[in-house]
């Protein structure tokens, strides 16, 4: 399953609207009945369903964490959507959390980028004014960090 | 390497209660269902149920309704089959088996456990 | 219950030899979907069922070609165009397209 999570089984309730199967498959924003003969829609808000398929229940919405803002709720065919708040963003290498966009640029660095949900800030070396390739850079620790412990490597 | 590997032979008596366990690797375990079979010595084979890991949504044959109970634990990525009120029409090699979620795919038993064998006596 | 039956019960056949099991089903086994839910599993002595077929005549990955089912509504056939030592066993047909799941007794292909 390509999607996030699978959505408790569902017994058709009288408010679940029900079709026949096109070819086998139902249409997005519903799921298959266990015997194969029947599409059951999903459940607004609490499940979905993005193509046609024969999958045996819809799946389950997608809760934005804290730290993320809804950008569009769940509706039976398309999954919630979030982002990450003002100040943090999403790696691609580690997308279940948003992480804290760096206050500054390592010495000799100059900012070319605001952070953005998606995107740390850029930093290019200043004589340069080019990207810097990805690397790892070991910040000397500020004041705020030595008091606090937190000073740390940071790849770019 | 898919892999089910289900829990060792089991002597109980008559009236009592078993578990036994179908422990899966090799593969995502919330991403299929898991059933279970029954085969009596020397006999054919009977499809007790199936249990969707992720949601413990389950679905039963009519015959094994108050007899078998289906449940499982995403963590461990094993599935469980409870027996009650035993007999010894019960005595029989019981099997997990694994199926897909789409329909299509749901009573293809891809991947076998090796066999719980169950012996009810007095 | 969709009853299974399976013709001959024991099999015998000399190994490079043809044979042919036969499944019956009591009702048609054709689903509203079009799709025809018959499947072959074999049990090698000792051990846990396989999967062979899947849908009348698909074979299931790393199953030998000279395996092949056909047939259709109530009648089905698994035919092994050479038989082999490593293919002795009881042969099982099931079908799913109705509830509940049922197999076949099972053939036993056993040497002459």
């Known amino acids: 399953i390509t999607q996030q999570d699978l959505a408790p089984q569902q017994r058709a309730a009288p408010q679940q609207k029900r079709s026949s199967p096109s070819e086998g498959l139902c249409p997005p924003g519903h799921h298959i009945s266990e015997d194969g003969r029947d599409c059951i829609s999903c459940k607004y808000g609490q499940d979905y369903s993005t193509h046609w398929n024969d999958l045996l229940f819809c799946l389950r919405c997608t809760r934005c964490d804290s730290g993320e803002v809804e950008l569009s709720p769940c509706t039976t065919t398309r999954n919630t959507v979030c982002q990450c708040e003002e100040g943090t963003f999403r790696e691609e290498d580690s997308p279940e959390m948003c992480r804290k966009c760096r206050t500054g640029c390592p010495r000799g660095m100059v900012k070319v980028g605001d952070c953005t949900p998606w995107s740390d800030i850029e930093c290019v070396h200043k004589e340069s004014r080019t990207v810097a390739a990805p690397s790892v850079f070991i910040f000397p620790p500020s004041d705020e960090q030595l008091k606090s412990g937190t000073a740390s490597v940071v790849c770019l | 390497e898919v892999q089910l590997q289900q829990s060792g032979p089991e002597l109980v008596k008559p009236g009592a209660s078993v578990k036994m366990s179908c422990k899966a690797s090799?593969?995502?375990?919330?991403?299929?269902?898991m059933h279970w079979v029954k085969q009596k010595p020397g006999q054919g084979l009977e499809w007790i149920g199936y249990?969707?890991?992720?949601?413990?949504?389950?679905k039963y044959n009519e015959k094994f309704k108050g007899k078998a109970t289906l449940t499982s634990d995403k963590s461990s990525s094993t599935a469980y089959m409870e027996l009650s009120r035993l007999t010894s029409e019960d005595s029989a090699v019981y099997y997990c088996?694994?199926?897909?979620?789409?329909?299509?795919?749901?009573?293809?038993?891809?991947?076998w456990g090796q066999g719980t064998t169950l012996t009810v006596s007095s | 219950d969709v009853v299974m039956t399976q013709i001959p019960l024991s099999l015998p056949v000399s190994l490079g030899d043809q044979a042919s099991i036969s499944c019956r089903s009591s009702?048609?086994?054709?689903?509203?979907?079009?799709?025809?839910?018959l499947h072959w599993y074999l049990q090698k002595p000792g051990q846990s069922p396989k999967l062979l077929i899947y849908?009348?005549?698909n074979r299931f990955s790393g199953v030998p070609d000279r395996f092949s089912g056909s047939g259709s509504g109530t009648d089905f056939t698994l035919k092994i165009s050479r038989v082999e030592a490593e293919d002795l066993g009881v042969y099982f047909c099931?079908?799913?397209?109705?509830?509940?799941?049922?197999f076949g007794g099972g053939t036993k292909l056993e040497i002459k």
């Open positions: 099931s079908q799913s397209t109705h509830v509940p799941h049922t």
């Open positions: 088996a694994r199926g897909g979620i789409n329909y299509d795919y749901l009573y293809y038993f891809d991947y």
């Open positions: 849908k009348v005549s």
């Open positions: 090799g593969y995502t375990f919330t991403s299929y269902v």
């Open positions: 249990i969707i890991p992720y949601n413990d949504g389950t």
């Open positions: 009702q048609s086994l054709v689903h509203s979907n079009g799709n025809t839910y």
